[in-house]
C-alpha cells in the first residue's frame, strides 16, 4: 500500500493530527523534499551573519557573513574575523606574519616564502608580509648579452625585519 | 504580469461578500499573496496574506471578520459580516519572491466596497 | 503585534529641498522595511525594500536607512511629483505575534 505521505509535496508536511492529509509549513519553517512528516525550523541568519538567501516554504535560509568576518565550515557555519593581508588570526587577534612568511588573504595563516633555491633558482622579487617571492630563472640560465629583466616589488620595500 | 481585484459593491451590513483578486502571467504557486485595504482618506491596513505553499495568515485584529482562500488563479476574500466600518478601497498585491520574509511589488488598482444600510 | 509608528504625520517642503520620514518598529525587525509611495487614486508603489535597497526604476533620491526598530526615508531634491503619502511596511513574517506585514500610519509629502 502506498505511504498517503509520498504524495505531499515540498513545502508541506504529513499531518499526522489531521488524518494525514497535507498541511502547508507555517512561516519560518520549509520542507525541501515530498513527504516529510514535520518542517524544519528556518535558520535565523543573527549576529555577526547576515542573511544571503531567505528562507521560504521550500528551502532554508543562507547565511554568510557581515563585512569584516568570513565563513567557515559547511553552510557557513561560524563567521571568522578578517585580519589584513600580511596577518594571521591567533588567540590575540591579528598579528603581523613573522620575517619569512606571507599571507595574501585576509583569513588564513601565514605561510613561508618559497625557497627558490630548493630549485635551483634565484630571488627575482624580494618577498613581504604580503607577498610571496618571485623566483627567478637560475644565473646559469642566463647566456652572455642577454640583458636580465627587473620586476617592481610588490608592496614597495624588498623586505622587512622580523619583529 | 498583473493583478486584479474584482467584487466591490454596495452591500447592506452584516450581508457576505466575496472579493476576487484574479491574477495572469504568474503562478500563484511560487508568490505570496497579501489582502491590504484603505478605508477613505485613511492609512493603508493589513488584512491577511496566502503563501505560495497555501498557508494563510490573518492579521490580529481580523478575528474571523475576513476569510482568505486560494485557487490556482485567484485569491479570495471574503468579508463575512461587513459593517460600516468595513467601507473601503481593497487591494491584492503580489510578492517579490516566494520567501517567508518577503515584499510586495506588483499591486492591483483596488476595488471599492460601500458598506451602508 | 508588531506596531509600526510613523513621524511626522505630514510635512512640507520646497522644490528641492529634503524631506525625512522616520518608522519605529515595535519590536526588532532586522531590516525587514519596505516603503511605499501612493498617489490619490493610485495603489501603493514600492520604493525600498529591505530597508535600504532601491527597487526597479526607483528615483536615487530616495534614499533608505536604519536596521532593528529605527528607519528613516529620506527625499532630496524634491520635485513636485514626490507629493504623495509615504508607508512604511515591516515584512518580518516570523515575528513572536506571527503578524509581520503591518503599516505604519503614513506620512503626506506636501511640495511647495
Known amino acids: 500500500l502506498q505511504d498517503p505521505c509520498s504524495n505531499c509535496p515540498a513545502g508541506t508536511f504529513c499531518d499526522n493530527n489531521r488524518n494525514q492529509i497535507c498541511s502547508p509549513c507555517p512561516p519560518n519553517s520549509f520542507s525541501s523534499a515530498g513527504g516529510q512528516r514535520t518542517c524544519d525550523i528556518c535558520r535565523q541568519c543573527k549576529g555577526v551573519f547576515r542573511t544571503r538567501k531567505e528562507c521560504s516554504s521550500t528551502s532554508n535560509a543562507e547565511c554568510d557573513c557581515t563585512p569584516g568576518f568570513h565563513c567557515l565550515g559547511a553552510g557557513c557555519s561560524m563567521c571568522e574575523q578578517d585580519c589584513k593581508q600580511g596577518q594571521e588570526l591567533t588567540k590575540k587577534g591579528c598579528k603581523d606574519c613573522c620575517f619569512g612568511t606571507f599571507n595574501d588573504q585576509k583569513r588564513g595563516i601565514c605561510r613561508p616564502w618559497t625557497n627558490c633555491s630548493l630549485d635551483g633558482k634565484s630571488v627575482l622579487v624580494n618577498g613581504t608580509k604580503e607577498r610571496d617571492v618571485v623566483c627567478g630563472p637560475s644565473p646559469t640560465d642566463f647566456s652572455p648579452g642577454t640583458p636580465s629583466t627587473t620586476m617592481p616589488v610588490p608592496g614597495g620595500e624588498p623586505g622587512h625585519t622580523s619583529h | 504580469q498583473s493583478v486584479e481585484e474584482s467584487g466591490g459593491r454596495l452591500v447592506t451590513p452584516g450581508t457576505p461578500l466575496t472579493l476576487t483578486c484574479t491574477v495572469s502571467?504568474?503562478?500563484?504557486?511560487?508568490?505570496?499573496m497579501i489582502w491590504v485595504r484603505q478605508a477613505p482618506g485613511k492609512g493603508l491596513e493589513w488584512i491577511g496574506v496566502?503563501?505560495?505553499?497555501?498557508y494563510i495568515s490573518h492579521a490580529t485584529w481580523v478575528k474571523g471578520r475576513f476569510t482568505i482562500s486560494k485557487t490556482s488563479t485567484t485569491v479570495g476574500l471574503e468579508i463575512t459580516s461587513p459593517t460600516t466600518e468595513d467601507t473601503a478601497t481593497y487591494f491584492c498585491?503580489?510578492?517579490?519572491?516566494?520567501?517567508?520574509?518577503?515584499?510586495?511589488?506588483?499591486w492591483g488598482q483596488g476595488t471599492l466596497v460601500t458598506v451602508s444600510s | 503585534d508588531i506596531v509600526m509608528t510613523q513621524t511626522p504625520a505630514s510635512v512640507e517642503a520646497a522644490v528641492g529641498g529634503t524631506v525625512t520620514i522616520k518608522c519605529q518598529a515595535s519590536?526588532?525587525?532586522?531590516?525587514?522595511l519596505a516603503w511605499y509611495q501612493q498617489k490619490p487614486g493610485q495603489p501603493p508603489k514600492l520604493l525600498i525594500y529591505?530597508?535600504?535597497t532601491l527597487a526597479s526604476g526607483v528615483s536615487s533620491r530616495f534614499k533608505g536607512s536604519g536596521s532593528g526598530t529605527e528607519f528613516t526615508l529620506t527625499i532630496s531634491d524634491l520635485e513636485s511629483a514626490d507629493a504623495a503619502t509615504y508607508y512604511c511596511?515591516?515584512?518580518?513574517?516570523?515575528?513572536?505575534?506571527?503578524?509581520?506585514?503591518?503599516f505604519g500610519g503614513g506620512t503626506e509629502v506636501v511640495v511647495k
Open positions: 498585491a503580489r510578492s517579490a519572491d516566494g520567501s517567508w520574509s518577503t515584499y510586495f511589488n506588483l
Open positions: 511596511q515591516t515584512n518580518y513574517c516570523c515575528s513572536s505575534s506571527d503578524n509581520g506585514f503591518a
Open positions: 496566502v503563501y505560495d505553499n497555501g
Open positions: 502571467g504568474f503562478s500563484l504557486s511560487t508568490y505570496a
Open positions: 519590536e526588532s525587525i532586522s531590516n525587514y
Open positions: 529591505k530597508a535600504s
